[in-house]
Interface confidence: low
């Protein structure tokens, strides 16, 4: 299953497959999870060793058991690969590392005003993999404002240096927020020039495509079909680049498939993994386990449960079959495709759904009347799971936040539906950032159940929770996927960087905002805002944040939306959005229902129907 | 042999104006940082400017901004330090020192090579 | 301004002895440190720098450790030529600052 705790000063023995180097601990679980191989990472941050060398290291490792013996080392961060884990799979790492240069290849330097417009040079550069720029106070004058463009062999850095008014980051490509855009066009019968950086063999070009997508360095790939006229390349994927970033040039041959990668693409990435199953085909590699199971999608399945697999073949062969049941030959290889692919064979294959970001049908969860004022403009999806709850009567208004918390349930306050209990009238937007960007053709959620919290009694700011089932549920995107919960009754987290997000008011008196608004609000304990409410009580269910000096809050409008804080580098959603005195008033914090105090009336109440829990838990 | 060699310090009166030479030789001078250093009798020392290779950049610490300025002519392998404004806390011995990279990216210092100092006093 | 501060402000030892000198920032400096040695009356001269890396010519029984905030400059077996002052310096950031000095006299 899932597992996404964090071992701090510990580090995996053995096992080791790969190794480069990363700013943190969640780059290189991210780079572990699109490893074919690995399953856990062990990562040294600059200040656990002193042998320059390692500092930054991130090694990714394997082990035929799934575990690897930890030893103590001071600094150190191990954890788990996050195959399997669904939506919070993605390769998009969107963090500034000040005080961090990343080393590659230069080759592009310009003058820019900040390191939000650098990271959008390298976005918006089809061979930009990340980047690092020298600040107004870096102490060469001649270097300040530079943004350097940088690639590497691996699409990691050559090397990690601490340094002074530097900051680096990585391409927001794999968030699928570049301005070049992509070609969609699978060009039959052509073949590409230029470099080769990887051969895999693969069943068609669509999976080709999508291994070039993920591939540090494909820009477009060639593909070459089943009934190539040299047998040894047959299936063959080439995966290319080349100094201009597009085919140099291309030569009409027959069975030739070839096309580009989608990292380009805007707003939309396949998904990293594949999920078509190839009758009359054998996938050839290292065997990992064979049992017996009924039918091909069981066979797909139980390779998807069985973490170290890549890559199965169901046989259909009378003497691999008994009863209802054939043979699932579990397999795996070096670079994660098959090592050899034969047509004309009673068996079926396909790959494991492990790395398939749309998960099961659950919400997220973890082991371990009120808008934004002072507040940042956001930016596409930097939350994900922030929705807007309009209702539709005459007009059409934006009335509260929500959170998405899994496929079908989006998690709110209560109190949104004081004097509106009606589903119909409720619209729910996903994904979206402006909401001037909503026309009468953008595609909403309707309601096919609001659960208010029974202790909720309308004007009192208890219980002030409801969760809402979506009629259909939703697919998960870079831009539209779900906030973790936290566990239950957590109190031992220590959150210090938390966020409140919404489309409310920029002030007490003011109107509904038209770009997502974020702002950074220290949480405050529940002794200090119970000073501050004397005439309320302040319950242990409840959680306040906010400044002493005010001027920044939620305000009306972001009712219901979501009070996050990362920890370990994961979001959790530990605040719904609930009351407050005025907005961003002196000594006045904001209130929020405290999320980890109703975990079991949450898992209770999205249970499906057949009773199986609706929870997921990643760790 | 590489060595660096300071002229020009002296007895100033506060508000006088002076300026300090420092003559290299032995290494490709327009390849390197330079910077100046001071010492105050009895004190530990103190970091004062510092110029790029090709004397495009120029920094200051915070306590000479605005009164001294720092140059170089690589043509006659030459760094200056023009002190005007001078203060009786300005009193100290003045080293030019050669900034040296370890780092390759030419962006973390340690000064590897030193003048034997010249005396610079402040005083009515 | 990052503030460099050594201990201890003196040592006297032996010849042959162990000596050991610290060096604490103000916040962390990552292995952007250097040591100097300085006679009176002479301009310092650079034994260590990236906190642990020993500058060429500079004699053996010199070596440094640390990263972060706390640095360790070590003379293995103390040598006549040794006395003086110890000098520690950050180029994390600017301005570049130095430690006041740890003073070795020889016994």
């Known amino acids: 299953g899932c597992l996404t705790q964090l071992y701090e000063n510990a580090f995996f023995r053995g096992g080791d497959v790969a190794s480069m180097y990363t700013p943190n601990a969640q780059y290189c679980q991210m780079r572990c999870t699109f490893h074919p191989r690995c399953l856990l990472f062990s990562f040294l941050p600059a200040s656990s060793i002193n042998d320059m060398e390692k500092r930054f290291g991130c090694f990714l490792k394997d082990s035929v058991t799934g575990t690897l013996p930890k030893v103590h080392r001071t600094g150190a961060v191990s954890g788990h690969s996050l195959k399997q884990c669904g939506h919070q799979i993605s390769a998009c790492h969107r963090d500034i590392y000040k005080g961090v240069d990343m080393r590659g290849v230069n080759f592009n330097v310009s003058k820019v005003s900040s390191v939000e417009e650098c990271q959008k040079r390298c976005t918006s550069n089809i061979r930009c993999q990340f980047f690092s720029y020298a600040t107004q106070t870096f102490h060469k004058a001649e270097y300040r404002n530079n943004c350097l463009l940088k690639y590497s062999p691996g699409g990691t850095p050559t090397a990690i240096k601490v340094l002074s008014n530097v900051e680096s980051g990585f391409s927001l490509k794999p968030c699928a927020l570049s301005e070049i855009g992509c070609h969609m066009n699978i060009f039959q019968h052509l073949a590409f020039s230029d470099v080769d950086v990887a051969r895999v063999l693969t069943p068609d070009a669509f999976v080709c495509r999508t291994i070039c997508t993920y591939h540090p360095n494909c820009l477009f790939f060639t593909f070459y079909t089943n009934v190539w006229k040299i047998e040894s390349q047959r299936n063959v994927c080439l995966l290319k680049t080349s100094e201009s970033g597009t085919p140099s040039s291309s030569t009409p041959q027959e069975n030739t498939i070839s096309g580009y990668s989608l990292l380009t693409c805007k707003r939309t990435l396949p998904e990293p993994c594949h999920s078509k199953i190839y009758p009359g085909v054998d996938f050839g590699g290292e065997e990992l386990n064979v049992t017996f199971v009924k039918g091909v999608n069981v066979c797909q399945e139980t390779c998807t449960k069985m973490i170290r697999c890549q890559f199965f073949t169901y046989s259909l062969l009378p003497e691999d079959c008994k009863e209802e049941k054939c043979k699932c030959f579990l397999r795996l290889s070096m670079d994660g495709s098959p090592t050899r692919i034969a047509y004309g064979t009673q068996g079926s294959s396909g790959y494991s759904l492990r790395l398939c970001n749309t998960g099961d049908n659950s919400v997220c969860t973890t082991k371990t009347s009120t808008r934004i004022v002072g507040g940042t403009n956001s930016s596409w999806g930097e939350w994900p799971w922030q929705v807007s709850l309009q209702v539709k009567l005459t007009a059409q208004r934006h009335l509260c936040g929500g959170s998405l918390i899994g496929h079908q349930w989006v998690l709110t306050a209560a109190h949104c539906f004081d004097g509106l209990p009606l589903q119909d009238v409720w619209r729910i937007y996903s994904g979206i950032l402006n909401l001037s960007d909503i026309t009468k053709d953008t595609p909403f959620s309707q309601i096919k159940e609001i659960i208010i919290h029974q202790n909720y009694k309308v004007s009192e700011g208890n219980h002030d929770i409801a969760l809402i089932k979506l009629q259909a549920p939703l697919n998960y995107t870079e831009f539209q996927k779900p906030i973790c919960l936290p566990s239950k009754g957590d109190t031992s987290t220590i959150y210090t960087n938390c966020w409140v997000t919404g489309w409310g008011f920029s002030k007490e008196k003011g109107e509904i905002q038209n770009i997502l608004q974020k702002v950074n609000i220290p949480l405050v304990t529940n002794e200090e805002c119970q000073k501050r409410y004397q005439d309320y009580k302040i319950t242990q269910r409840m959680v306040c944040a906010g400044y002493k000096e005010g001027g920044k809050d939620a305000c009306k409008g972001d009712s219901g939306g979501p009070l996050v804080c990362k920890h370990n580098g994961m979001w959790r959603l530990v605040g719904i959005t609930s009351w407050g005195e005025g907005c961003a008033r002196r000594e006045q914090p904001g209130v929020y229902t405290k999320v980890a105090e109703y975990m079991d009336w949450i898992l209770e109440k999205t249970q499906s129907s057949d009773g199986k829990a609706q929870m997921q838990s990643p760790a | 042999e590489v060595q660096l060699l300071e002229s020009g310090g002296g007895l100033v009166q506060p508000g006088g104006s002076l300026r300090l030479s420092c003559a290299a030789s032995g290494f490709t001078f327009s390849l390197y940082d330079m910077t100046w250093v001071r010492q105050a009798p009895g004190k530990g020392l103190e970091w004062v400017s510092g110029?790029?290779?090709?004397?495009?950049?120029?920094i200051y610490a915070d306590s000479v901004k605005g009164r001294f300025t720092i140059s170089r002519d690589n043509s006659k392998n030459t760094l200056y330090l023009q002190m005007n404004s001078l203060r009786a806390e300005d009193t100290a011995v003045y080293y030019c020192?050669?900034?040296?990279?370890?780092?390759?990216?030419?962006?973390?210092?340690?000064?590897?090579?030193w003048g034997q100092g010249t005396m610079v006093t402040v005083s009515s | 301004d990052i503030q460099m501060t050594q201990s201890p402000s003196s040592v006297s030892a032996s010849v042959g002895d162990r000596v050991t000198i610290n060096c604490r920032a103000s916040?962390?400096?990552?292995?952007?440190l250097a040591w100097y040695q300085q006679k009176p009356g002479k301009a310092p001269n650079l034994l260590i720098y990236a906190a642990s890396s020993l500058q060429t010519g500079a004699p053996s029984r010199f070596s440094g450790s640390g990263s972060g905030t706390d640095f360790t400059l070590t003379i293995s077996s103390l040598q006549p030529e040794d006395f003086g002052t110890y000098v520690c310096q950050q180029s994390y950031s600017l301005p570049w600052t130095f430690g006041l000095g740890t003073k070795v006299e020889v016994r």
């Open positions: 916040q962390d400096i990552s292995n952007w």
């Open positions: 110029i790029s290779s090709s004397g495009g950049v120029t």
């Open positions: 020192a050669r900034t040296y990279y370890y780092d390759s990216s030419g962006y973390a210092d340690a000064f590897d090579i």
